[in-house]
Amino acid sequence: CTCVPPHPQTAFCNSDLVIRAKFVGTPEVNQTTLYQRYEIKMTKMYKGFQALGDAADIRFVYTPAMESVCGYFHRSHNRSEEFLIAGKLQDGLLHITTCSFVAPWNSLSLAQRRGFTKTYTVGCEECTVFPCLSIPCKLQSGTHCLWTDQLLQGSEKGFQSRHLACLPREPGLCTWQSLRSQIA
């Protein structure tokens, strides 16, 4: 299972549910579905209030039981460490894969934290982070922001990933904007 890590804004916008949580148990494998689930303790929800409705407490996260079919394996044994988890809802259950955005909260830049808590949502409706994987690449729409981090360094560690969001400048136009300047 291979996938290019997405820009955090893309992860936020494409996910049904974005939460902050601690992994508090060892994985359990369901003997019918062959999915494994991790027990989590959710501390914050950033996206998914409407999708979840009244069932606003997520206690488990589900993933395939094998890496080759994109199963996520949680390596940290620190049960007090908080993680940002962006996943999909299937039958009311939170599902993630190795391609999902799952990162220690403390590893996120202040700008990314701001993005997840407040700003990324502003760009979801109209704007698209467009990955530039090889030169030359050009914008296909005014609402696209060219994401070039992969050309220069690891995509998650790039400047655009860590500090910028693709946000509307005016109708029909999106541009990279600094999340730093928006931090109160």
């Epitope: 060892t26 994985p27 579905t33 062959l34 494994q36 094998m66 890496e67 080759s68 079919v69």
Partner: antibody, heavy 113, light 111 residues
Framework: QVQLVESGGGLVQPGGSLRLSCAAS????????MSWVRQAPGKGLEWVSA????????YYADSVKGRFTISRDNSKNTLYLQMNSLRAEDTAVYYC??????WGQGTLVTVSS | DIALTQPASVSGSPGQSITISCTGT?????????VSWYQQHPGKAPKLMIY???NRPSGVSNRFSGSKSGNTASLTISGLQAEDEADYYC??????????FGGGTKLTVLG
């Protein structure tokens, strides 16, 4: 009581195909994931493949990926293993297992020219 | 291509206790509470003796017990009997390979 009965083993030439079946009884078949495990003569156990209760998720060992296909027919309470492009190293007793708690008696597959 | 390491053989006299170890990694034994132990007599199918590290299926003698510490699981057989002579295999879930077995341990009951 839980019963698993494998069939379909036999002698086949390298490059040939074989389809194993496992008839299950004594439990709600669709509620359990099923697996195939094999044991080469005088060797240890090797997991081959697994399938979820609905058949929607399938997993394979690297050694058989692309050559073997696991499937199930819940209406017939039967598990299958379609084996293509067989090699000498696939020679083994093949066991079907209910999520590893109950095992059949096995069926011998011999790949030889 | 064996992921879990077991001693090739162990032996003990009737009435004694023996322990078989099963060493893996944090992606299998250490990462899950899913270690099983199987007993296999020659020409027979494996029989589940312990599941989920330390649980015994109904019908299995309480002389068999399992435990785990870190990346190593153990099967202990107390009050060894002649019919315990068999091959024993450990198994664990593994997120890379779904499930893995140990290479097997031949238990010989002396005398």
């Amino acid at each position: 009581q839980v019963q698993l009965v494998e069939s379909g083993g036999g002698l086949v030439q390298p490059g040939g195909s074989l389809r194993l079946s496992c008839a299950a009884s004594g439990f709600t078949f669709s509620s359990y994931a099923m697996s195939w495990v094999r044991q080469a003569p005088g060797k240890g156990l090797e997991w081959v493949s697994a399938i979820s209760g609905s058949g929607g998720s399938t997993y394979y060992a690297d050694s058989v990926k692309g050559r073997f296909t696991i499937s199930r027919d819940n209406s017939k309470n039967t598990l299958y293993l379609q084996m293509n492009s067989l090699r000498a190293e696939d020679t083994a007793v093949y066991y079907c297992a209910r999520f590893f708690d109950y095992w059949g008696q096995g069926t011998l597959v011999t790949v030889s020219s | 291509d064996i992921a879990l390491t077991q001693p090739a053989s162990v032996s003990g006299s009737p009435g004694q206790s023996i322990t078989i170890s099963c060493t893996g990694t944090s992606s299998d034994v250490g990462g899950y509470n899913y270690v099983s132990w199987y007993q296999q007599h020659p020409g027979k199918a494996p029989k589940l003796m312990i599941y989920d590290v330390s649980n015994r299926p109904s019908g299995v003698s309480n002389r068999f017990s399992g435990s785990k510490s870190g990346n190593t699981a153990s099967l202990t057989i107390s009050g060894l009997q002649a019919e315990d002579e068999a091959d024993y295999y450990c198994q664990s879930y593994d997120y890379q390979q779904f499930t893995v077995f140990g290479g097997g341990t031949k238990l010989t009951v002396l005398g």
